[in-house]
Interface confidence: low
């Protein structure tokens, strides 16, 4: 009678992580009597995957009814494959004895695992930057296999070209990581913008993974200041307004100075939001001109988001106004137009 052969028809099998891998194995004879075992790897360090005779292998199921005496199909299915399962699997026939002895091995089936990349994580610069500056964003994704992967950067749907990408390790590995750095030029309109890192891989079936970063966490749009003077009904009073426009983020402190002396300091609270995400705010100062003998230099000084203060001055001519003794400068609270943006 012809000697038993162990046939592993598949030289290689590729499976996506999380799926099941079927490893085929048939024998050509029922003789000699003895169990089949599956191993990963060869030699003394090989790892037992399945023993037909004994043991508990919760991830392994037999494809055919291997308990039948006449069964010659010893194919197995391994569930919930991970990159760590990659390797060469051998179907080995043992001869019954005390102990059982190895009789013949199949040629082996190499299992490669298509690992899905992890959700890309995008991180931006530690400190805010102003429009026209270039900032760097990094994108990282891990755990994918095979090594081939495509990474793209977008800003508001527009693809970016200024980026560098590395895939590690360079050599063979059960799984890989990708790291990319993109350079983005900020504009004043970027408060609502997003930077998106998109990763495409064979395991994703054409549905790429995306990681995002909101430029609202990166950008600082410095305010523009305008100081104007409006007449008021009371003939000795002048209303001076400081319009603080198009700033982001909201953190802002305003100080009024009269001839270089601090008159009032206030913090922007009730602001108006523009469609582009920046804010406007208005503060006013009600000045009793009769309290001043000479012209007054009024300065609106703004410290935005911890940056050096910027200021705008306005010269208030008081010579034309009648003087009244004993009158002090009066300063009202902040004025603002409060509204929600919908």
């Amino acid at each position: 009678e012809e000697e038993l052969q162990v046939i592993q028809p598949d030289k290689s099998v590729s499976v996506a992580a999380g799926e099941s891998a079927i490893l085929h194995c048939t024998v050509t004879s029922l003789i000699p009597v003895g169990p089949i075992q599956w191993f990963r790897g060869a030699g003394p360090a090989r790892e037992l995957i399945y023993n037909q005779k004994e043991g508990h292998f919760p991830r392994v199921t037999t494809v055919s009814e291997s308990t039948k005496r006449e069964n010659m199909d010893f194919s197995i299915s391994i569930s919930n494959i991970t990159p760590a399962d990659a390797g060469t699997y051998y179907c080995v026939k043992f001869r019954k004895g005390s102990p059982d002895t190895e009789f013949k091995s199949g040629a082996g089936t190499e299992l490669s695992v298509r690992g899905k990349p992890s959700a890309p994580v995008v991180s931006g610069p530690a400190a805010r930057a102003t429009p026209q500056h270039t900032v760097s964003f990094t994108c990282e994704s891990h755990g994918f296999s095979p090594r081939d992967i495509t990474l793209k950067w977008f800003k508001n749907g527009n693809e970016l070209s200024d980026f560098q990408t590395n895939v590690d390790p360079v050599g063979e590995s059960v799984s890989y990581s990708i790291h990319s750095t993109a350079k983005v030029v900020l504009t004043r309109e970027d408060v609502h913008s997003q930077v998106i890192c998109e990763v495409a891989h064979v395991t994703l079936q054409g549905d790429p993974l995306r990681g995002t970063a909101n430029l609202s966490e990166t950008i600082r749009v410095p305010p523009t200041l305008e100081v104007t003077q409006q007449p008021v009904r009371a003939e000795n009073q002048v209303n001076v307004t400081c319009q603080v426009r198009k700033f982001y983020p909201q953190r802002l402190q305003l100080t009024w100075l009269e001839n270089g002396n601090v008159s009032r300091t206030e913090t922007a609270s009730t602001v108006t939001e523009n469609k582009d995400g920046t804010y406007n705010w208005m503060s006013w100062l009600l000045v009793n001109v009769s309290a001043h003998r000479d012209d007054v230099k009024l300065t609106c000084q703004v410290e935005h988001d911890g940056q050096p203060a910027v200021s705008k001055s306005h010269d208030l001519k008081v010579s034309a106004h009648p003087k009244e003794q004993g009158s002090n400068t009066a300063a009202e609270n902040t004025g603002s137009n409060e509204r929600n943006i919908y």
């Epitope: 508001n156 527009n158 997003q194 943006i341 919908y342």
Partner: antibody, heavy 120, light 107 residues
Framework: QVQLVESGGGVVQPGRSLRLSCAAS????????MIWVRQAPGKGLEWVAS????????YYADSVKGRFTISRDNSKNRLYLQMNSLRAEDTAVYYC?????????????WGQGTMVTVSS | DTQLTQSPSSLSASVGQRVTITCGAS??????MHWYQQKPGKQPKLLIY???NLEAGVPSRFSGSGSGTDFTLTISSLQPEDFATYYC?????????FGQGTKLEIK
């Protein structure tokens, strides 16, 4: 899989209120912007309101501004639409939808809709 | 507000035919135009996003093009399941307006 299920529709008299709810599952609700869109019988789609993932940004159509309020509870994976001072022209199927990523992105998943009828 | 005008409002076509629907915007919406399909009694389904990107799971016979104010949805070879109403929608700025719809009927 992603699921959005609207509820709370019904028949209501003009001037009265109704609160719609949208239960989300199958995705990380707190990562996504959400939208209400309506469709009057035999008519086209009309965007009603949007809310960002953290509720920081809320927008309304002019036709509902001041009467409708969109809100969300990320701990319960729910989106709401409080509709006050209802009018006959608010009669429509109301859909909740998910907006992936930023402001400029489309509505990639929609609920099956809930019917609101405003009639005396 | 950005007005969207779809053309035609309705269209009769045969299976296998190539069909084009256009959407014009009253001002530039850059590439932030999306296309949806809606069948009677059902919720809308996203087909094309950001002018030309095919949504996952949508057959490749659907394609989109355009930028600025003029956009096109093309179905290269009509299938029986494609008879529905199609809407364009802009997300360049709120309010996020829809076109009035194009009803595609079987000839």
């Amino acid at each position: 899989q992603v699921q959005l299920v609207e509820s709370g529709g019904g028949v209501v008299q003009p001037g009265r209120s109704l609160r719609l709810s949208c239960a989300a599952s199958g995705f990380t609700f707190s990562d996504y912007g959400m939208i209400w869109v309506r469709q009057a019988p035999g008519k086209g789609l009309e965007w009603v309101a949007s809310i960002s993932s953290s509720s920081s940004y809320i927008y309304y159509a002019d036709s509902v501004k001041g009467r409708f309020t969109i809100s969300r509870d990320n701990s319960k994976n729910r989106l709401y639409l409080q509709m006050n001072s209802l009018r006959a022209e608010d009669t429509a199927v109301y859909y909740c939808a998910r907006r992936y990523y930023g402001f400029n992105y489309p509505f990639d998943y929609w609920g099956q809709g809930t019917m609101v009828t405003v009639s005396s | 507000d950005t007005q969207l005008t779809q053309s035609p409002s309705s269209l009769s076509a045969s299976v296998g035919q190539r069909v084009t629907i256009t959407c014009g915007a009253s001002k530039s919406v850059r590439t932030y135009m999306h296309w949806y399909q809606q069948k009677p009694g059902k919720q809308p389904k996203l087909l094309i996003y950001s002018a030309s990107n095919l949504e996952a799971g949508v057959p490749s016979r659907f394609s989109g093009s355009g930028s600025g104010t003029d956009f096109t949805l093309t179905i290269s070879s009509l299938q029986p399941e494609d008879f529905a109403t199609y809407y364009c929608q802009q997300s360049n700025e709120p309010p996020y307006t829809f076109g009035q719809g194009t009803k595609l009927e079987i000839k």
